[in-house]
Amino acid sequence: QEFHFGPCQVKGVVPQKLWEAFWAVKDTMQAQDNITSARLLQQEVLQNVSDAESCYLVHTLLEFYLKTVFKNYHNRTVEVRTLKSFSTLANNFVLIVSQLQPSQENEMFSIRDSAHRRFLLFRRAFKQLDVEAALTKALGEVDILLTWMQKFYKL
């Protein structure tokens, strides 16, 4: 059982554990999200992503979650259960990112560019909100991310 993001294979990640970690904090995160009209992982970000694109897109999205979302939220929360859940998610995201090596070949430019444009839509939506609201919304949308990642899961 592994993820196949196009040519990028990821082993050793148990989706069940990601879901368990998310569900442990889901109600808290989504209850704190007061901006229900906006969505960061909107349709245009995740719709019809090709296999070739998927490696680039999941790499940039998970790196953003690691460097911006988890890192900043970690400094703002004190509840042990919440920290534990985010640590589980973050550790697994690290494991995924560490195995992703998107091709930097020139012939992949258009695919890389398409994935980057998708990521920019997400980042732009994130930056339009104030920091606290953006972090909360990004964490509350981890289920959208996990659901989309299922497309690339292999039994």
Epitope: Q1, P15, L146, Q150
Partner: antibody, heavy 119, light 106 residues
Framework: ELQLVESGGALVQPGGSLRLSCAAS????????MSWVRQAPGKGLEWVSH????????FYAESVKGRFTISRDNAKNTLYLQMNSLKSEDTAVYYC????????????WGQGTQVTISS | SYELTQSPSVSVALRQTAKITCGGD??????AQWYQQKPGQAPVLVIY???RRPSGIPGRFSGSNSGNTATLTISGAQAEDEADYYC?????????FGGGTHLTVL
């Protein structure tokens, strides 16, 4: 060999209670979320309830919320569905299913157990 | 709540191609599964993650998922493919099944 065996189905009067069991073998039970899915006579599949591998997260269909309780005993490799305040519309074959992703990827199903609610 | 729409029945001539569709709002951003069920039997997973085939499922079964429609295609339908087919996705802490499509092989 992976196996899911449901039991506990019976004929019960409206308003009554029933507890279904699903004995699992051939895989590490607590590593996987599980679900109950039912099928009324001549009808389609209807998801009933879901429980995470550690048992801490549970979800229910609106039609059974407040009446049914899903649980698991990981030491006994067994999934349960406690059904209270049963109605005639709960009549169905109840299947337990192993979730291979944690959010609705049912690669393995039991053979089902018949629940009939009638006076 | 999220809904999936399937046509109740589809007919196909033996060894021809059958297409069964499943409609849902922005279903293309979700992972779609397809199950085959024969009378008196439990469902069997035939396609998962939009287009992947579990081991043991014949190569004539394929799937796609884009926009508002997921599609199960059976290329060169066989008599044993006559069954009910259900699409399914996960949406906000719940599994959702389509109403089912009965495939008749003529």
């Amino acid at each position: 060999e992976l196996q899911l065996v449901e039991s506990g189905g019976a004929l019960v009067q409206p308003g009554g209670s029933l507890r279904l069991s699903c004995a699992a073998s051939g895989f590490t039970f607590d590593d996987y979320a599980m679900s109950w899915v039912r099928q009324a006579p001549g009808k389609g599949l209807e998801w009933v309830s879901h429980i995470s591998g550690n048992g801490r997260s549970t979800f229910y269909a609106e039609s059974v919320k407040g009446r049914f309780t899903i649980s698991r005993d990981n030491a006994k490799n067994t999934l349960y569905l406690q059904m209270n305040s049963l109605k005639s519309e709960d009549t169905a074959v109840y299947y337990c299913a192993k979730d291979d992703y944690g959010s609705g990827l049912y690669a393995y199903w039991g053979q089902g157990t018949q629940v009939t609610i009638s006076s | 709540s999220y809904e999936l729409t399937q046509s109740p029945s589809v007919s196909v001539a033996l060894r021809q191609t059958a297409k069964i569709t499943c409609g849902g709002d922005n279903i293309g951003s979700k992972s779609a599964q397809w199950y085959q069920q024969k009378p008196g039997q439990a469902p069997v997973l035939v396609i998962y993650a939009d287009s992947r085939r579990p081991s043991g499922i014949p190569g004539r079964f394929s799937g796609s998922n884009s926009g508002n429609t997921a599609t199960l295609t059976i290329s060169g339908a066989q008599a044993e493919d006559e069954a009910d087919y259900y699409c399914q996705v996960w949406d906000v802490s719940a599994a959702v099944f389509g109403g089912g499509t009965h495939l008749t092989v003529l």
